[in-house]
C-alpha cells in the first residue's frame, strides 16, 4: 500500500484539530530540547509511511503505541481519507489479539512520540509547499 491517493488536506485538518493535541498531551512535561530528533520525510505519501511505521510498529525502547489516543485517531483518519487503507489493517488487528499484552513504560516511548511530532510537522510543511 502507498499513500499517494489520500486526501492530504483532510488528513491535515484532522491532525490539526485532534491528533496534534493528543500528541502534545502525551509529551506534556518534556521540553522540545529533551530529544535531538532529526527526522525527515521527502513528500506527503512518504511522511505518512513513516508515521505509519512509528505509530503502529514496535521499536527497541517502545513496545507499543497502538492503544494510545493519538494512535487510534491516526488510524481512524487514515482509514477515512486513504482509499483502501482499512483493508491493509485486517491482519494487524487479528495479530494484535493473539499477542501477549505487555505493559509499556510511557517515558520509554517519549522519544518515539517526539519523532512522530516531527514527522507530522514535516507532513504539514510539505503540504504548505505544494499550495
Amino acid at each position: 500500500y502507498d499513500f499517494t491517493n489520500c486526501d492530504f488536506q483532510k488528513i491535515e485538518a484532522d491532525y490539526l484539530r485532534t491528533i496534534s493535541k493528543d500528541l502534545i498531551t502525551y509529551m506534556s512535561g518534556t521540553k522540545s530540547t529533551d530529544f535531538n530528533n532529526t527526522v525527515s520525510c521527502s513528500n506527503r505519501p512518504h511522511c505518512l509511511t513513516e508515521i505509519q511505521s512509528l505509530t503502529f510498529n514496535p521499536t527497541p525502547r517502545c513496545a507499543s503505541l497502538a492503544k494510545e489516543m493519538f494512535a487510534r485517531k491516526t488510524k481512524a483518519t487514515l482509514a477515512l481519507w486513504c482509499p483502501g487503507y482499512s483493508e491493509t489493517q485486517i491482519n494487524a488487528t487479528q495479530a494484535m489479539k493473539k499477542r501477549r499484552k505487555r505493559k509499556v513504560t510511557t517515558n520509554k516511548c517519549l522519544e518515539q512520540v517526539s519523532q512522530l511530532l516531527g514527522l507530522w510537522r514535516r507532513f504539514i510543511r510539505t503540504l504548505l509547499k505544494k499550495q
Epitope: S40, T49, A92
Partner: nanobody
Framework: EVQLVESGGGLVQAGESLRLSCAAS????????LYWYRQAAGIERELIAS???????NYVDSVKGRFTISRDNAENTMYLQMNSLKAEDTGVYYC???????????WGQGTLVTVSS
Amino acid sequence: EVQLVESGGGLVQAGESLRLSCAASGSGFGVNILYWYRQAAGIERELIASITSGGITNYVDSVKGRFTISRDNAENTMYLQMNSLKAEDTGVYYCASRNIFDGTTEWGQGTLVTVSS
C-alpha cells in the same frame, strides 16, 4: 514475501568492531520497518535496533552510541555497525523485516557474534 540472510558474525576481542549485513530478496523490503534482534544464551530474544524506510533509527539503551543501524533500499540490504564491543554483546544476531501495515514479520537465520574479554 521477504527472505533474509545475515552475514558478518564472528569472534572478536572486546573493544573491537564488527559489521553485520542482512541481505533481502523478494518484495516489500523498501517500506518495511527493519530490525536487529540479539539472543544471548538463556535469554529471551531482544530487539536492539530499528530503522524505518526513511532511515529513522531507534536503539535500546545498552547499544546506543556504540551500534549504528543503516539500510540501503536500492541494494535491499541492512547493516549493523558494532563498535566498542563488550563481552555482553555476545549472542546470535537476527535481522527481521516487518510489514508496517499488517505486522507480518520475516526472520533471518541468525549470525553468531562472540566477544571475548
